[in-house]
């Protein structure tokens, strides 16, 4: 058993049928020693009495708020949570397998630029009864400081008779120098507790392998005299790093028919521009990618043809 | 039909085609190296993150781009900014002082150089010669050192009477070429900063 | 104590459906995932299904999938088996199981795929 | 294709010990433990060893597990003629949990 936050506790049980539990020692946070009864969530039932209460928890029955009195009066709290271990493997119930990019994985990581800032995402179906807590820190033995807001629903989705909901949290790198070398990665861990189940979810990552740039900005088509041809111009987006000449970008210019089938024309390019050849009723897209370490690609930026 | 690819133009900077090389050379080995010793661990995620030129270079402080200087974060360790020398500089009209970021490379190329022809000569003698270590690479390293120009001590490479165990060689190769590869990022961005510059 | 008993086994043709099911007593059955396990005669054990706690979630075996669904009815205790397309090569000793770090397992059921 | 690979069959005298060795890799026994079972003819398989080393109550001592890197082993120490019977070793892959991996099965013989 281990203190989650004040007057909280999480009971770890190895879950099978018949397992025999665990022994807990509940201790009222009293100066008193006499008269003390003991009694679980809204039940009047009496489950004790004494200044300690020793109970055996086994199952989510056992668990919950277990409150000593005296008197009819309220003299403390303790809530009691469960975390499955499930034939050695922490039980995942709360959320989401987002098999993305591989199996196994709960949470995503992005980050728009190497300032040290990140979002990461969640899924689950649970709508109620459920809070998350978030911490970070980069490394592990030695951690350093990476300070975490609150996590919010963000989205709401529905998949066939399902509802999903997403929940998403922002995290800063206390002191990052956006040129630096990662040798440690960022460890995000998250709490999640539903209703009396307590799971914890872990991520770990370097800043560099979750870069996704924001889509280039202001995209713009010049057409060329007596020409099919157009000429295309982008700028870098604005939440990328600075300076461009260090933190270079490379790009792919794609010329898209209305149909899906239609075969795509694309180009890669360094530069800011491209000239391509702009077909009725097409659309042209650019995406945007670090230019030596190859992380994800932007999400397109397009405008229509005409 | 697939559009040409718009090559970049290698500008006044002589070193930044030899960078760009250099990039390529380690990545395509790396990804050859996890796709050969897939039952070793070579991925991102399962080795220790190790830096052979720790304490002993500063690439990453000595070339810090001249914006980057404000940041406290970036300042930690870093004792000199950029002072000038070497041949990839084709003009003397550079606003900022270099030949410590510049020198500071080629030292890192020069350790990495010996690290990677003492692990080839013993992945020589594995039995099994599951792994070797790309000529291309070698040579990308050396035509970049060469094109720096720095005058320095010669590394002798170290040699090893004891017989070597396989399995730590391939793993110490995958620690290597992720660490050389990060490196040669960071050079890829200072070429292209100064090349800009 | 913690009792499966299965039920459901039998001989049927190539191509035919066979329905196993396995009754729970003994243990709070909604509570814990279970799993399929068979074993073709003389050969060794291989996985076949899992299904989680409450049915959100259900993983197969690379041979029986897109022919065999696991389900549960935690109302009535009982894990299901509902077997689709059989082929001679399915024919073997079906086990149910718990899943936890100490597992039950049901007595076995024989089902025969021969025509 | 998810499989331990074990030895076809052991064999030792009464008294003496035996080893069954469950060879796997990174993603199944090198990130997870290590079950061990034992099965009489016509009888379902039993546990003997759990979360690599662990014996459930009722399981003699002379049975014992081990893991180390990608494999596992069963040791039974003092073999008697009551422990002829296939034994089986069991773990999940990393990223398919809860898809379960059995070992390819050891018939151990009391001469």
């Known amino acids: 058993i281990w203190e989650l936050k004040k007057d909280v506790y999480v009971v770890e049980l190895d879950w099978y049928p018949d397992a025999p539990g665990e022994m807990v020692v509940l201790t009222c946070d009293t100066p008193e020693e006499d008269g003390i009864t003991w009694t679980l969530d809204q039940s009047s039932e009496v489950l004790g009495s004494g200044k300690t209460l020793t109970i055996q928890v086994k199952e989510f029955g056992d668990a919950g708020q277990y409150t000593c009195h005296k008197g009819g009066e309220v003299l403390s709290h303790s809530l009691l949570l469960l975390h499955k271990k499930e034939d050695g493997i922490w039980s995942t119930d709360i959320l989401k397998d987002q098999k993305e990019p591989k199996n196994k994985t709960f949470l995503r990581c992005e980050a728009k630029n190497y300032s040290g800032r990140f979002t990461c995402w969640w899924l689950t179906t649970i709508s109620t009864d459920l809070t998350f807590s978030v911490k970070s820190s980069r490394g592990s033995s030695d951690p350093q400081g990476v300070t975490c807001g609150a996590a919010t629903l963000s989205a709401e989705r529905v998949r066939g008779d399902n509802k999903e909901y997403e929940y998403s949290v922002e995290c800063q790198e206390d002191s990052a120098c956006p040129a630096a070398e990662e040798s440690l990665p960022i460890e995000v861990m998250v709490d999640a507790v539903h209703k009396l189940k307590y799971e914890n979810y872990t991520s770990s990552f370097f800043i560099r392998d979750i870069i996704k740039p924001d889509p280039p900005k202001n995209l713009q088509l010049k057409p060329l005299k007596n020409s099919r041809q157009v000429e295309v111009s982008w700028e870098y987006p604005d939440t990328w790093s600075t300076p461009h000449s260090y933190f270079s970008l490379t790009f792919c210019v794609q010329v898209q028919g209305k149909s899906k089938r239609e075969k795509k024309d694309r180009v890669f390019t360094d530069k800011t521009s491209a000239t391509v050849i702009c077909r009725k009723n097409a659309s042209i897209s650019v995406r945007a990618q670090d230019r030596y370490y190859s992380s994800s690609w932007s999400e397109w930026a397009s405008v229509p043809c005409s | 039909r697939n559009l040409p690819v718009a090559t970049p133009d290698p500008g006044m900077f002589p070193c930044l085609h030899h960078s760009q090389n250099l990039l390529r050379a380690v990545s395509n080995m790396l990804q050859k190296a996890r796709q050969t010793l897939e039952f070793y661990p070579c991925t991102s995620e399962e080795i220790d993150h190790e830096d052979i030129t720790k304490d002993k270079t500063s690439t990453v402080e000595a070339c810090l781009p001249l914006e980057l200087t404000k940041n406290e974060s970036c300042l930690n360790s870093r004792e000199t900014s950029f002072i000038t020398n070497g041949s990839c500089l084709a003009s003397r009209k550079t606003s900022f002082m270099m030949a410590l970021c510049l020198s500071s490379i080629y030292e890192d190329l020069k350790m990495y150089q010996v690290e990677f022809k003492t692990m080839n000569a013993k992945l020589l003698m594995d039995p099994k010669r599951q792994i070797f270590l790309d000529q291309n690479m070698l040579a990308v390293i050396d035509e970049l050192m060469q094109a720096l120009n720095f005058n320095s001590e010669t590394v002798p490479q170290k040699s090893s009477l004891e017989e070597p165990d396989f399995y730590k060689t391939k793993i110490k190769l995958c620690i290597l070429l992720h660490a050389f590869r990060i490196r040669a990022v960071t050079i890829d961005r200072v070429m292209s900063y100064l090349n800009a510059s | 104590q913690v009792q499966l008993v299965q039920s459901g086994g039998g001989v049927v043709q190539p191509g035919r459906s066979l329905r196993l099911s396995c009754a729970a007593s003994?243990?709070?059955?909604?509570?814990?995932?279970m799993h399929w396990v068979r074993q073709a005669p003389g050969k060794g054990l291989e996985w076949v299904a899992f299904?989680?706690?409450?049915?959100?979630?259900?993983y197969y075996a690379d041979s029986v999938k897109g022919r065999f669904t696991i389900s549960r009815d935690n109302s009535k205790n009982t894990l299901y088996l509902q077997m689709k397309s059989l082929r001679a090569e399915d024919t073997a000793v079906y086990y149910c199981k718990t899943h936890g770090s100490h597992d039950n397992w049901g007595q076995g059921t024989m089902v025969t795929v021969s025509s | 294709s998810y499989v331990l690979t074990q030895p076809p069959s052991v064999s030792g005298t009464p008294g003496q010990r035996v080893t069954i060795s469950c060879s796997g890799g990174r993603s199944n026994i090198g990130s997870n433990t290590v079950k061990w079972y034992q099965q009489l003819p016509g009888t379902a398989p039993k546990l003997l060893i759990y979360g690599n080393d662990q014996r459930p109550s009722g399981v003699p001592d002379r049975f014992s597990g081990s893991k180390s890197g990608t494999s596992a082993s069963l040791a039974i120490t003092g073999v008697q003629a009551e422990d002829e019977a296939d034994y089986y070793c069991?773990?999940?892959?990393?990223?398919?949990?809860?898809?379960?991996?059995f070992g390819t099965g050891t018939k151990v013989t009391v001469l």
């Open positions: 069991q773990s999940y892959d990393r990223g398919t949990h809860p898809l379960t991996i």
């Open positions: 003994g243990f709070t059955f909604s509570s814990y995932g």
């Open positions: 299904i989680r706690y409450d049915g959100s979630n259900k």
